[in-house]
């Protein structure tokens, strides 16, 4: 029968957990991405921010997974209005922030 969307969200959370736990050298060579308002923007904005990162196999699966929760094609900079005061943070911190946000969504049952 139909599988609750929470199953897919759990997969994404587990992938982010793996990234944070297996991190040895600086994630994506310390690449910086735009800090975003996750509450206001959600999956598409998170994907938009990470789209700027290329050549980083560690977050490749995360980028692809996020696209499955965003209804349209995302191109870099599409959601610049939702960047937090033009602030950039390391990918590692971005992943941690995203993980906390998704865990909160999961607990509250907000899957989409």
């Amino acid at each position: 029968g139909p599988v609750p969307p929470s199953t897919a969200l759990r997969e994404l959370i587990e992938e982010l957990v793996n990234i944070t736990q297996n991190q040895k050298a600086p994630l994506c060579n310390g690449s910086m991405v735009w800090s975003i308002n996750l509450t206001a923007g959600g999956f598409c904005v998170a994907l938009d921010s990470l789209t700027n990162v290329s050549g980083c196999s560690a977050i490749e699966k995360t980028q692809r997974m996020l696209s499955g929760f965003c209804p349209h094609k995302v191109s870099a900079g599409q959601f610049s209005s939702l960047h937090v005061r033009d602030t950039k943070i390391e990918v590692a911190q971005f992943v941690k922030d995203l993980l906390l946000h998704l865990k909160k969504l999961f607990r509250e049952g907000q899957f989409n």
């Epitope: 969307p5 199953t7 897919a8 969200l9 997969e11 997974m65 499955g68 965003c70 094609k73």
Partner: antibody, heavy 123, light 107 residues
Framework: EVQLLESGGGLVQPGGSLRLSCAAS????????MSWVRQAPGKGLEWVSA????????YYADSVKGRFTISRDNSKNTLYLQMNSLRAEDTAVYYC????????????????WGQGTTVTVSS | SYELTQPPSVSVSPGQTASITCSGD??????TCWFQQKPGQSPVLVIY???KRPSGIPERFSGSNSGDTATLTISGTQAMDEADYYC?????????FGTGTKVTVLG
Amino acid sequence: EVQLLESGGGLVQPGGSLRLSCAASGFTFSSYAMSWVRQAPGKGLEWVSAFSGSGGSTYYADSVKGRFTISRDNSKNTLYLQMNSLRAEDTAVYYCVQDGLGPYFYNYGMDVWGQGTTVTVSS
Amino acid sequence: SYELTQPPSVSVSPGQTASITCSGDKLGDKYTCWFQQKPGQSPVLVIYHDSKRPSGIPERFSGSNSGDTATLTISGTQAMDEADYYCQAWDSSTYVFGTGTKVTVLG
């Protein structure tokens, strides 16, 4: 390691039926959408059907709509394709493919393919 | 129904650049994937999200997508790149594959 193993192919007469199976391993099967893609001898790739992981939605190519039915058994990590009213033009290698996550799974990219099972429709 | 059109064949000398186009109405608005298929083998994803390479795919493979055309570029083409290539996109609840392009590496 993610693996997909198709079975159930064979020779069938026009108008006949066949059920293909795809045994999946190495990933959380229930979370992912799955597709069937076919390739007629000497021809290109043709998508046949998809079954989403998150919402249980099914999708079909116009060429098989009303004749083929996709289904899945998450407890057995298995994808199926029930093919009825088979025609000569359904002759092809049928591939089982791992799709993406979430309601917009099609954005992910089909990066895991089985080896395929051959279906021949002939009298 | 939506259609993706590719040139039937492209020939390239070793070390040179091969470009394969994929044309479809407003294709630039959609994510495009590219697959490589060698004789007797299953297809392999070489580009997703228009221009991203999955892990394990050589850097010589690159992609772009805008307007009505997506392009797969193979820089410094090698003999092992000889294969059929297919573009793919999603439109109106269906996947659509391109017509396919046979890349021949000369010599």
